[in-house]
Structure formats: C-alpha cells, structure tokens
C-alpha cells in the first residue's frame, strides 16, 4: 500500500464485539457522568436500561449534554486535558450534564487496532442515547459530542448510528492516519450532526499527519494554517525533551485544538474569530478577512451554526497560550517603484499606533513576492486590542541586517551597475480590522515624502481628505 | 462472506410500483449503508441514494427523491428499494451495495424492464 | 454537486503495457476517490479506495495516484482479463458521483 497505514481490518473480519472485550468483567465502554470538577471525585456510571444512576446522580433532562470522548492512548489514563475540558464546561454551562465517554481499555492498543474500535465505541454512544430519548424531556437536539483526535471520528459513528440527529459534533484536530480520504461514513463528516465544527491544529502535507488535513464538517477552522503552533517549536519544548520527551513536540499542537476550545469557554470576553479562506497562503497575504456572507465566525464553543456551509475552512492567527486571541490587520499597500528594484524583495515592519496600546514592530510577512506598481496585500496581527488606529510607521530594514539581502543587493549590483539604489514610493496604506471590519486609509504626512529606501522609515497618519470608515459597530457583537 | 442476494428481474407496465429487495449476509447488516445504484443499458453508474438500516437513516440524490424510497427490515437482514410512476426512463439494472471503503460489495443486480 | 469527468471513453492497450486512466473532480475532493471495475455482464467490483489504498484481494498490478481535483488510476501490465469498464468515484461528500467510465479495449 502507498499510504502510510495500511487499511483497517475487512469488512467480513468485523466482530459484533472487539477483541479487548472478550475476558474482561468491566465494559468497555463506560459513561462516566461527572458530577463534580473534582478530577478525583468519581462521579456516577450510566449504563443503558438502569434508570437509577440518572435519578441518583441529578441528570437534568432538559438541559445540554456533552459528551467528551478521548482519543488513542499511549498510558492507559486519562490525560490532564480531560479534566481541564470537564471544569470548564462545568464553569460555562453550570445545569449541563458532562458524561465522559471512557473507551480506554479499546483506545489502549496498536494505533490500527484503535482504530478498527472506533466503530463498535460510537456504536455504544449511539445505543446510549438512543436509550435516553426513550425518557421524557430529553432531546437529541441538546446533545454535544465534544471527540478529541481518534475520539472525533467516533463522535462521527455515534452520530451516524444514533436514532435521529446529534445537535451538534466538535471535532478537536480529529485523526489524520486511516481518516484521510476515507469514506464520507468511515469518519467524521457534515452528515453526522445538525451542526459539525472542526479544529484542525496538526496537518502537515508532507511526513504523517497526526490530525486530519481535509476539511470534514460543517465549518472547519484552521489555526495557524492547522499546521505549526506558536509555543509549540522546538525551542519551546526543549525542557520536554531533555526530559526524554520528544512526543511532547507533537502533543502540543495536536492538544492545542482542546486548549483553544476550553479559551472559548472560559474566556468568553476574548473570543477569537476565524476567517473563511481557500487556502493557507492567501489568508497569510491577508486577503480573507471579511465578515460579508457569514465568511467570519467565533472559534470553539462559541462558534455559530452555518449549516448552509459545509466543509468551509477557517482560518486566524492566535497566541502561543490562553487567552488565545489575536486582532488581525489586513494592509494594503501600493509600491511604485521608478527604477527596477531586480529580485531584492524589501523587508518591510509596520508599527501600528492605537488609542489603547501600541504594536511592536511587526514584519511584513511576503509570502510569495511583492508586486511593484501594484497594490500589496499583507496580513499583521497584535496580540493586544489597540483600540482606534491613529498612525503607523513603516520601516525598511537595512541591508546590513539580512546576509539574504546583502547577497541580493550584491547580485543586483553586478547585474546592474549603473542603478544600484533601491526605492519604492508608498502614499497610502488602507488597513481594515478583522476584529471590528472597519476601514481606514492612512496617508503619509507630506505628499512630496512617499519614498523609502533600505534603513528609513516612512510616517503614516489618517488620510486629511476623510479617511473611510465602514461597518461603525463590530459585527461580532451578536456573537460574543 | 459478505454476500448480497438480490431479487429477480421484473418486467412492469408505465405508471406502476416495483419494491427490490437485497439480503444481505456475512456481516453486521445494521451499522453498514446500503446504496442503491442506478445503470442504464449502455450508460454508467448512477448513484440514487442509500440507507443505514439499523437507524433507517436514508440519503438520496435530488433527482431520484419522489421516485425511490429505502426501507429495511433487520430481522431479516433485507434492504428494499421501491420505485413508483415507472416511466421507460427506469428501465435499468438497478443494483445494491454494501459501503464501508467504498462500495465494497455489491449484488448481482435485478434488472427492471418498463413497457406497455 | 461534485462532477466527476474520465476524459477518455475508450482506450486500447496491449497485454504487458501499462495504461492510465484519468479522472478530473469538479471541486476538490482531497484523497476520497474509489475506483471501480466492471466486466461484461457482471456487477462493479472496488478496486481502489481514498485514491491509492488497494482492496482486499485486489493483484498489485493496479494502482491509484492523485489527490485534490486530479486522480490516476494505473495497471502496471495489462492482462487480458482486465477488458472491462472503469469507473472512478468521490466519496468526499453526498451525493456520490460517478465518472462517465472509461471502456479498456484489449487489442
């Protein structure tokens, strides 16, 4: 087989039960209804066709029910962001139910053997809920399958099995090996729920990718194109490695989809939003922040149905930890240049200049090259809310800086002798929000001063002849 | 192994119902779809929806909702596809198939001739 | 929908030469493409599943490639059982879609 995991065991070969079950007295699969934060406090066991536990424990039919089901597992135990997820669910929605699907005697096995389990485990969540239906005041419609990895595609069966329609599935970076390109029933899919979101935070196109690349629901959101995490490079867990961890490396960003969803249920007053976009690349020139046509949507929990979309990806910056959330800045910038500038792509940092806070000194990140006389889309973000723009400072940096300009600016003066100055003129930057969608156009100072060079700098105010400002009231107002 | 035994073939006048039947043996009948697939003599495969007994969850494609409808009896391991106001447009082998990869099993097909 | 497109109807190859057989989403549909064979008078049988995993039983003289809009479908050396029609199929979303087929002639 050319793919790097081999199929999961025939169709013929699939028993009625696993092979993990045959021996063992204790399910499987347990429903553990957790009835306190406590990690230690055990919490009531549900069974299907036993009444009692429900009555005993204080299920609240009528209120929300969220299902947390873990993925593959190395130790056998329950990780700590299990527990993080139960608090905070606790925190945000004080009357719901918070059943933690326990699989883990099937989950601790050969990655392949897990897998071929997953179907039989969402089979049991599946039998579970259909068992509840049967109460009074109970509805399919409050039901929210939270499946972390290998967890995620059997929240996909649970909701493919069950007697009706989950209310809603979030998929926290669900399992790439065996799922990618796999049967739109043989993993997590739009048809698996009444709403599916999906947080994709370990793709990678080339060697394996531990979560799942293509998009699989209704919304399918990307942070950091889904693929390198900030906090989660080599040097940051260099104390993890030193520790005979490298596992650590991958964990981090795989785990990273539960920590920005648990952001959104206790940070509710920094929520992060996440841009429609075709791909990786154009989000990164800053194209895609628009909130028209619902291309925009709150991150995690907060995230609003769109049903009408289906495998839409999402995307946003974020910080390396909580709170998570960035302000995003699309810039766009018009070069003109009198003479050729040759290859030499100009190292450009804006510092922008709020009512509330300033920026540091951010690059402009080129992602393929800059278009001289033309106009240049470029994407920046802050980690603080600046407030109102008043003014920006575009820098060149110098030549000296850079052994990749200094050789580019060598080349080009042999292939140029006689025009070895570099120069381009900016008269206005139009920047918008992604936070708050309003635009506004800054102009420089004085009209005659457009130009820089490598080493200058170049002063930015808002434009005298009625800067534009669209959109007053940020849309996001009815999301938060 | 997993087999899928289909029903005969049938010969019905315009305007008329026929019910096909698939029974299905070899493997848990309720937690796999069935489809059913549409081939005109001389054209391709034409997916025209399917069915996960278990939940009698069903999916069709636009054009055939109001022509085909999907049951399932698990006691007897059988899928049915009943075709209504036959038309000589639905003259065709009509076959099921059981998904899991792909279409991984598929039966021998029962062919359906509409004529006056 | 999803329009799946196999350019070629027909193709003809000789015993031992290897043939491609071309298939062309409309929209991308990743690595969830199935390819099909179908002999005369008999039902399709699953060759290929997500673009390149073989199926069960299925000789190793066949095989897929292609992932987004683009797939490939590939008999390394053609045997004269292999006359027979092949169809690709996405399986990324509802409806599934089928490819117009492509009828492989042995000469």
């Known amino acids: 087989s050319p793919v790097p995991f081999g199929p999961e065991g025939r169709l013929e070969d699939k028993l009625h039960k696993p092979k993990a079950t045959q021996t063992e007295v204790k399910p499987s699969v347990r429903f553990n209804l957790r009835t306190s934060k406590d990690p230690e406090h055990e919490g009531c066991y549900l069974s299907v066709g036993h009444s009692q536990p429900l009555e005993d424990c204080s299920f609240n039919m009528t209120a929300k029910t969220f299902f947390i089901i873990h993925g593959w597992t190395m130790s056998g135990i329950f990780e700590n962001w299990l527990h993080k997820l139960v608090s905070a669910l606790h925190t945000r929605e004080k009357d719901a139910n918070v059943v933690v699907v326990d699989w883990l005697p099937l989950a601790h096995q050969l990655y392949t053997d897990a897998v071929n389990n997953t179907r039989v485990v969402g089979h049991s969540i599946a039998r579970m809920l259909d068992w509840l239906q049967e109460k009074d005041d109970f509805s399919l419609g409050n039901v929210h399958l939270i499946g972390y990895s290998l967890g995620a595609h059997v929240a996909g069966y649970a909701g493919n099995f069950v007697k009706g329609t989950v209310g809603r599935i979030t998929g926290l970076d669900p399992a790439g090996p065996m799922f990618e390109g796999a049967d739109i029933h043989k993993r997590l899919s739009p048809d698996d729920a009444d709403f599916v979101d999906v947080l994709h935070t370990y793709t990678r196109s080339f060697g394996l990718s531990i979560g799942i690349q293509m998009p699989v629901g209704h919304i399918d959101i990307y942070p950091n194109g889904g693929d390198f995490q900030p906090g989660c490079g080599l040097n940051d867990v260099l104390g993890s490695i030193a520790y005979g961890t490298i596992t650590e490396v991958v964990k981090c960003e795989h785990e990273r989809a539960v920590h920005l969803f648990v952001d959104s249920l206790v940070n509710q007053d920094k929520p992060s939003f996440a841009f429609q976009c075709t791909d990786s690349n154009r989000f990164k020139k800053g194209i895609c922040l628009s909130c028209r046509k619902n291309r925009c949507n709150n991150i995690g929990y907060n995230a609003k149905k769109m049903r009408k979309k289906r495998n839409s990806k999402m995307y946003l910056k974020t910080r390396a930890g909580m709170p998570f959330k960035v302000y995003h800045y699309q810039l766009k910038v018009h070069m003109f240049s009198y003479n050729n500038s040759g290859d030499t792509q100009p190292t450009l940092y804006i510092t922008l200049y709020g009512s509330n806070a300033d920026s540091q000194n951010l690059p402009l990140e080129i992602v393929e090259k800059i278009e001289l006389n033309a106009t240049n889309t470029f994407l920046v973000y802050t980690e603080e809310d600046l407030g109102d723009l008043l003014k920006m400072r575009l820098t060149w940096e110098g030549v000296a800086h850079s052994w990749y300009n200094l050789w580019n600016e060598f080349r080009n003066y042999l292939s140029q002798p006689s025009n070895p100055s570099r120069e381009l003129y900016i008269r206005r930057i139009r920047v918008k929000s992604g936070e708050t969608q309003r635009k506004v156009t800054f102009c420089t100072q004085d009209p005659t001063k457009s130009s820089i060079s490598p080493g200058q700098e170049l002063w930015f105010h808002k434009c005298q002849d009625g800067w534009k400002m669209k959109n007053k009231t940020s849309p996001f107002v009815n999301l938060a | 192994q997993v087999q899928l035994q289909q029903s005969g073939a049938e010969l019905m006048k315009p305007g008329a119902s026929v019910k096909i039947s698939c029974k299905a043996t070899?493997?848990?009948?309720?937690?796999?779809?069935i489809a059913w697939v549409k081939q005109r003599p001389g054209h391709g495969l034409e997916w025209i929806g399917e069915?996960?007994?278990?939940?009698?969850?069903?999916k069709y494609n636009k054009k055939f909702k109001g022509k085909a409808t999907f049951t399932a009896d698990t006691s007897s391991n059988t899928a049915y596809m009943q075709l209504s106001s036959l038309t000589s447009e639905d003259s065709a082998v009509y076959y099921c198939?059981?998904?899991?990869?792909?279409?991984?099993?598929w039966g021998q097909g029962t062919s359906v001739t509409v004529s006056s | 929908d999803i329009v799946m497109t196999q350019s070629h109807k027909f193709m003809s190859t000789s015993v031992g030469d290897r043939v491609s057989i071309t298939c062309k989403a409309s929209?991308?549909?990743?690595?969830?493409v199935a390819w099909y064979q179908q002999k005369p008078g008999q039902s399709p049988k699953l060759l290929i599943y997500?673009?390149?995993y073989r199926f069960t039983g299925v000789p190793d003289r066949f095989t897929g490639s292609g992932a987004g809009t683009e797939f490939t479908f590939t008999i390394n050396s053609v045997q004269a059982e292999d006359l027979a029609v092949y169809y690709c199929?996405?399986?990324?979303?509802?409806?599934?879609?089928f490819g117009g087929g492509t009828k492989l002639e042995i000469k």
């Open positions: 198939a059981v998904y899991d990869y792909g279409a991984d099993y």
């Open positions: 199929q996405q399986h990324y979303s509802i409806p599934r879609t």
């Open positions: 997500s673009a390149s």
């Open positions: 070899g493997y848990t009948f309720s937690t796999y779809w």
């Open positions: 069915i996960l007994p278990g939940s009698a969850k069903t």
């Open positions: 929209q991308d549909v990743y690595t969830a």
